[in-house]
Interface confidence: medium
């Protein structure tokens, strides 16, 4: 599936997002993870997802964003983190979304 550009795994019970996902799917542009059970994001989570334009993370349990998980997403246009448990609008320790 290395040519896959869109992956919709919404409305599941995913609690882990292995960083290798985008190593295997380097062309991925749209990743929909809405309504899953992700609780933490960190630097490695999307480290290889460099071509993403849309990332949908609404309705998870993300309460902690460690360091700079979106620093590699230079092409990101849409990031949806609504309906999570975030207590701050800070999406990491440095400005990442241009």
């Amino acid at each position: 599936y290395s040519q896959l550009t869109s992956l919709d795994v919404g409305f599941n019970t995913i609690s882990k997002l292995e960083p290798e996902l985008c190593q295997k799917l380097p062309m991925l542009k749209v990743l929909n993870l809405q309504h899953n059970e992700l609780s933490q994001l960190s630097d490695k989570t999307f480290a290889f997802c460099t071509n993403l334009t849309e990332l949908h993370l609404m309705s998870n349990s993300i309460q902690k964003i460690k360091n700079n998980p979106f620093v590699k997403q230079k092409n990101l246009i849409t990031l949806d983190l609504s309906h999570n448990g975030l207590s701050s609008t800070k999406l990491g320790t440095q400005v990442q979304l241009e």
Epitope: S15, K16, L17, E18, P19, E20, Q23, E37, L38, S39, Q40, S42, D43, K44, T45, A47, F48, K66
Partner: antibody, heavy 119, light 107 residues
Amino acid sequence: EVQLQQYGAELGKPGTSVKLSCKVSGYNIWSTYIYWVNQRPGKGLEWIGRIDPANGNTIYAEKFKTKATLTADTSSNTAYMQLSQLKSDDTAIYFCAMGDHGGYVMDAWGQGASVTVSS
Amino acid sequence: DIQMTQSPGSLSASLGETVSIECLASEDIYSYLAWYQQKPGKSPQLLIYAANRLEDGVPSRFSGSGSGTQYSLKISGMQPEDEGDYFCLQGSEFPYTFGTGTKLELK
């Protein structure tokens, strides 16, 4: 900061069992995998297996399938490994480890627990 | 199981010298490779993951390269604190397997 706390040294007699613990602070183990690795005296690292604390699913290296049993308690954020039917060549340092959201990269390690098997 | 053959088994390097350690996999591991440093009595520390990604906080003198079955770790300018054991780890297939290890000493 993520920390994995392992406790001290275990002394076991041949044929008995020991249970090692690995308490994680600073990260919810439900969101990752816990790995176990051993190191015999003066030797290299050996991958024992991993557990998914969210559902209890385990994967073992073949040689540890009847030797090690991995469990986890998400309420206390602690993982366990029981070693059964101890033999002298089970004498080793046993490490627990984890990584961000799983995957093969173990980027946080416990300090190791020593197991000595002797009659 | 995938076998990871590491070479050399030991080496001695002078201060400032460039050092390379190789890891050869018995089959293609698609860059699912990490490098660890271990000092006596301590737990391993991650240096490199995904064959060439430097872990946060690791000095830039460490670098990784390779693909397919052949991978290497390079230390550009040996420092006293670089003494220790180095291991590669493949994460392409279960069971994950470590390399045989390389002991690096300061000459």
